[in-house]
């Protein structure tokens, strides 16, 4: 009588996460009597996967009906495979013994490899906004993929970026892996509508990469430019002065008018107009009663944008002895303005 052999015909099996793995095993004889057990790994720390004799193994089903008296097929199916199931599985024949069964023959083992898709890339930008010409860092993370080989690319508005560093962890063997990449992006004034994209390609994605995006509108701050101008006389003794606040982002903005350094009025930008590039324009005006002033008036438009230190622009208004002639630009002459920061 030929001595029993345990045959595991597959050296390796590759399964996608979430699917069912079939691990094949046959014995060449029914003698000696005794159970078949499946283990993951070898040696004293091996993990019991299935025991023909007893136990509850909810994820495991047998391919054949083991209650057939002539059954020699001990193949199993393991459902809902995860990367944690990766390893080498051994089909082991025991012969009956007392009090414990005795290991008789083992199959050569089947290595189960699990292909797992990477998680959707998550792109995060800097905690604080930055202004054009500054370089900011974006990070991209994706987890839980296997095998380790993976490709990551960065794009800004469809243009591939080159200034980035990528790490895949862990370095050694693992059931699954994570990727972490940091890209440097130089901001421009036109970036309000820009997007940064992290693209991950992996064998499990069948040529359809995963993408994570970040909108630069969450990152950029475009400071406003200010222009103060004096308008033609609206009525006797009154001059209309406007402050044009242009090309700012985000919208959060507070404007204060000062007359000779004293606060005249404060308002918050509300009815703004949006430019094509996503920045905003806003205009505020101040009606100055010239007859109330004996001396020249210094009008200052002071803007606090997005919680930043205020910027301002001033306009000198000459108080004329002949107010009726203000329209001739002699009495109320624009003597120029200067931009300064107020801290």
């Amino acid at each position: 009588e030929e001595e029993l052999q345990v045959i595991q015909p597959d050296k390796s099996v590759l399964v996608a996460a979430g699917e069912t793995a079939t691990l094949r095993c046959t014995a060449t004889s029914l003698i000696p009597v005794g159970p078949i057990q499946w283990f993951r790994g070898a040696g004293p720390g091996r993990e019991l996967i299935y025991n023909q004799k007893e136990g509850h193994f909810p994820r495991v089903t047998t391919v054949s009906d083991l209650t057939k008296r002539n059954n020699m097929d001990f193949s199993i199916r393991i459902g809902n495979i995860t990367p944690a199931d990766a390893g080498t599985y051994y089909c082991v024949k025991f012969r009956k013994g007392s009090p414990d069964d005795v290991e008789f023959k083992s199959g050569a083992g089947t290595e189960l490899s699990v292909r797992a898709k990477p998680s959707a890339p998550v792109v995060s930008g800097p905690a604080a906004r930055a202004t054009p010409q500054h370089t900011v860092s974006f990070t991209c993370e994706s987890h839980g993929f296997s095998p380790r080989d993976i490709t990551l690319k960065w794009f800004k508005n469809g243009n591939e970026l080159s200034d980035f560093q990528t790490n895949v962890d862990p370095v050694g063997e693992s059931v699954s892996y994570s990727i972490h990449s940091t890209a440097k992006v130089v901001l421009t004034r036109e970036d309000v509508h820009s997007q940064v994209i992290c693209e991950v390609a992996h064998v499990t994605l069948q040529g359809d990469p995963l993408r994570g995006t970040a909108n630069l509108s969450e990152t950029i701050r475009v400071p406003p430019t200010l222009e103060v101008t004096q308008q033609p006389v609206r009525a006797e003794n009154q001059v209309n002065v406007t402050c044009q606040v242009r090309k700012f982002y985000p919208q959060r903005l507070q404007l204060t008018w000062l007359e000779n350094g004293n606060v005249s009025r404060t308002e918050t930008a509300s009815t703004v107009t949006e430019n094509k590039d996503g920045t905003y324009n806003w205009m505020s005006w101040l009606l100055v009663n010239v007859s109330a002033h004996r001396d020249d008036v210094k009008l200052t438009c002071q803007v606090e944008h997005d919680g930043q230190p205020a910027v301002s622009k001033s306009h000198d208004l000459k108080v004329s002895a002949h107010p009726k002639e203000q329209g001739s630009n002699t009495a109320a002459e624009n003597t120029g303005s200067n931009e300064r920061n107020i801290y």
Partner: antibody, heavy 118, light 107 residues
């Protein structure tokens, strides 16, 4: 609790047929092989037939091969023994039994008496 | 065929051993079945040579070596009086067999 209840026994004439049933409860019937065992008056236990959990494979002792047929209906949790060409030697209490993983028996029914008499 | 003694007797509290021979160790699993009266349902007290079902008292144990199996009742009780059948499954022939039964009398 595992329960096995046989029925269908009775008195028949030699040469006639009889169908025994065994109603199973308290366990996943479709996962276990089952057997029929009989005991003639004043005699010991005698295994007759076995059937795999799925019902595809059947096994018989030589003396009943061709006369007895073991079958099962898993959705109905029922085991059957169709007996034909009965003789006086078939007079016995018939038990159904649940098999262990290695084809021994762990649970038995109460039995049903079959009497073959002219 | 499996061979076992026709009868054994013991006093309460004693240890009883019933042997069963005739099977090949490498191809046969043994079990022991208790029947308290003819025609009543047998009860499995040992299966797979030495495995005791959870509802069977621990005084029942089993072993197998060579071509024989043994049922041991340690501290036998009056209620253990019964006929004990040795049963076997042969992996070569796919056949279940029984011994003729051993009548245990507790004096």
């Amino acid at each position: 609790d595992v329960q096995l209840v046989e029925s269908g026994g009775g008195v028949v004439r030699p040469g006639e047929s009889l169908r025994l049933s065994c109603a199973a409860s308290g366990f996943t019937f479709s996962s276990y092989a089952m057997s029929w065992v009989r005991q003639a008056p004043g005699k010991g236990l005698e295994w007759l037939a076995g059937i795999s959990a799925g019902g595809s494979d059947t096994y018989y002792i030589d003396s009943v091969k061709g006369r007895f047929t073991i079958s099962r209906d898993n959705p109905k949790n029922s085991l059957y023994l169709q007996m034909s060409s009965l003789t006086a030697e078939d007079t016995a209490v018939y038990y159904c039994a649940r098999e262990t993983w290695n084809h021994l028996f762990d649970y038995w029914g109460l039995g049903t008496l079959v009497t073959v008499s002219s | 065929a499996l061979t076992q003694p026709a009868s054994v007797s013991a006093n309460p509290g004693e240890t009883v051993k019933i042997t069963c021979s005739g099977g090949d160790y490498y191809s046969t699993y043994y079990a022991w079945y208790q029947q308290k009266s003819p025609g009543s349902a047998p009860v499995t007290v040992i299966h797979s040579d030495d495995k005791r079902p959870s509802d069977i008292p621990s005084r029942f144990s089993g072993s197998a070596s060579g071509s024989a199996a043994t049922l041991i009742i340690t501290g036998v009780r009056v209620e253990d009086e019964a006929v004990y059948y040795c049963g076997g499954y042969d992996g070569r022939t796919y056949i279940n067999t029984f011994g003729a039964g051993t009548t245990l009398t507790v004096l």
